[in-house]
């Protein structure tokens, strides 16, 4: 059947998800397309312990989430709801800056390298996580 | 032995439709995206479609967008590629490829003609 | 759409020479680059990916080297083998695009 019962290999298996860490950069939106190449997304953070999680795996280096406001409200890749969900942004973040001279403000989200969250320019070629969840149907204990 | 056998190539004429098939053995197929890539006579290299392992995300070149629908048979480790209203500029050899995590292309198939004649 | 320049579109060599061939990409792709080889009537062999990771089975006479827009496939001493066409490949960004190839032919 197409039920995900374990994690692809070089995927890392956490509380029912699995995670693919890259080691290179892409621009968010191509981030996100190789995360939907492999039938993930990016990485959507619903708690402190998934958060502390991914810090650990990603050490101090700025790393794409799937949180954006590229349409206006920040939106997680998954349909989770941001208003009520988990947080962890920087002091004064998000702040939309435009002083970097690229064009435009700051769209979409990243772990920076203490693992607080930061908007920045959605070109910028940062690496990124990409999350997929295991079937809830394999999570069912085997009949005996 | 890692393997990609193309099929369901010929002539066929402008506007027709031709459905391409590619036979995956040697690996665990549904576990890779896979993709489409084409090369008019005496040309260069044009890349056409890629669709995930699972089958559920697929991207297009424009050139081929809303003509051609790339998708998969997990169960029977083929890949397809239907190709609509056909035209001349169409005339190539399709290879089909395997995709790697570095999102290049490790292994290909040994390709199949679609000419686009009247 | 990001563009792959390719440098020259052929060259000519004898065996033991040492062939490079150059390929810009229009934008910045960091190392999301690829080598391909041709023969006539056959299928493309991939020989380099993210711009220097050589592939398993490739002799180590082929290397590949570069990143942001510039990059570069060196042959250090053609064989008889070589005598191809060569293609790059950006997989940075949909599309991904191939250089037009560069023929390596016989001196």
């Known amino acids: 059947g197409s039920e995900r019962t374990c994690c692809p290999v070089n995927w890392v298996e956490h509380e029912r998800s699995c995670y693919w860490f890259s080691r290179s950069g892409k621009a968010w939106a191509d981030a996100d397309n190789y995360c939907r190449l492999e039938d993930a997304h990016l990485v959507v953070v619903t708690s402190w312990e998934e958060q502390k999680f991914v810090q650990h795996h990603i050490g101090p280096v700025n790393t794409w989430m799937g949180l954006h406001d590229q349409n206006g409200p920040w939106k997680w890749v998954d349909g989770t709801d941001y208003e009520t969900g988990f947080k962890n942004w920087r002091p004064e973040q998000p702040d939309d800056w435009y002083g970097h001279g690229l064009g435009g403000g700051e769209d979409c989200a990243h772990f920076t390298d203490d693992g607080r969250w930061n908007d920045d320019v959605c070109q910028r070629p940062y690496r990124w996580v990409c999350e997929t969840e295991l079937d809830k149907a394999s999570q069912e204990p085997p009949l005996l | 032995e890692v393997q990609l056998l193309e099929s369901g190539g010929g002539l066929v004429q402008p506007g027709g439709s031709l459905r391409l098939s590619c036979a995956a053995s040697?690996?665990?197929?549904?576990?890779?995206?896979m993709s489409w890539v084409r090369q008019a006579p005496g040309k260069g290299l044009e890349w056409v479609s890629v669709?995930?392992?699972?089958?559920?995300?697929?991207f297009y070149a424009d050139s081929v967008k809303g003509r051609f629908t790339i998708s998969r048979d997990n169960s029977k480790n083929t890949l397809y590629l239907q190709m609509n209203s056909l035209r001349a500029e169409d005339t190539a050899v399709y290879y089909c490829?395997?995709?790697?995590?570095?999102?290049?292309?490790?292994?290909w198939g040994q390709g199949t003609m679609v000419t686009v004649s009247s | 759409d990001i563009q792959m320049t390719q440098s020259p579109s052929s060259v000519y060599a004898s065996v033991g020479d040492r062939v490079t061939i150059t390929c810009r990409a229009s934008?910045?792709?960091?190392?999301?680059l690829a080598w391909y080889q041709q023969k006539p009537g056959k299928a493309p062999k991939l020989l380099i990916y993210?711009?220097?990771s050589l592939q398993s089975g490739v002799p180590s006479r082929f290397s590949g080297s570069g990143s942001g827009t510039d990059f570069i496939l060196t042959i250090t001493s053609v064989q008889p083998d070589d005598f191809a066409t060569y293609y790059c490949?950006?997989?940075?960004?949909?599309?991904?695009?191939f250089g037009h190839g560069t023929k390596v032919d016989i001196k």
């Open positions: 490829a395997k995709r790697t995590g570095d999102d290049v292309f490790d292994i």
């Open positions: 040697g690996f665990t197929f549904s576990s890779y995206a």
């Open positions: 669709i995930s392992g699972r089958g559920g995300t697929t």
């Open positions: 934008q910045d792709i960091t190392s999301w």
């Open positions: 993210a711009a220097s």
């Open positions: 490949q950006q997989v940075n960004s949909f599309p991904f695009t």
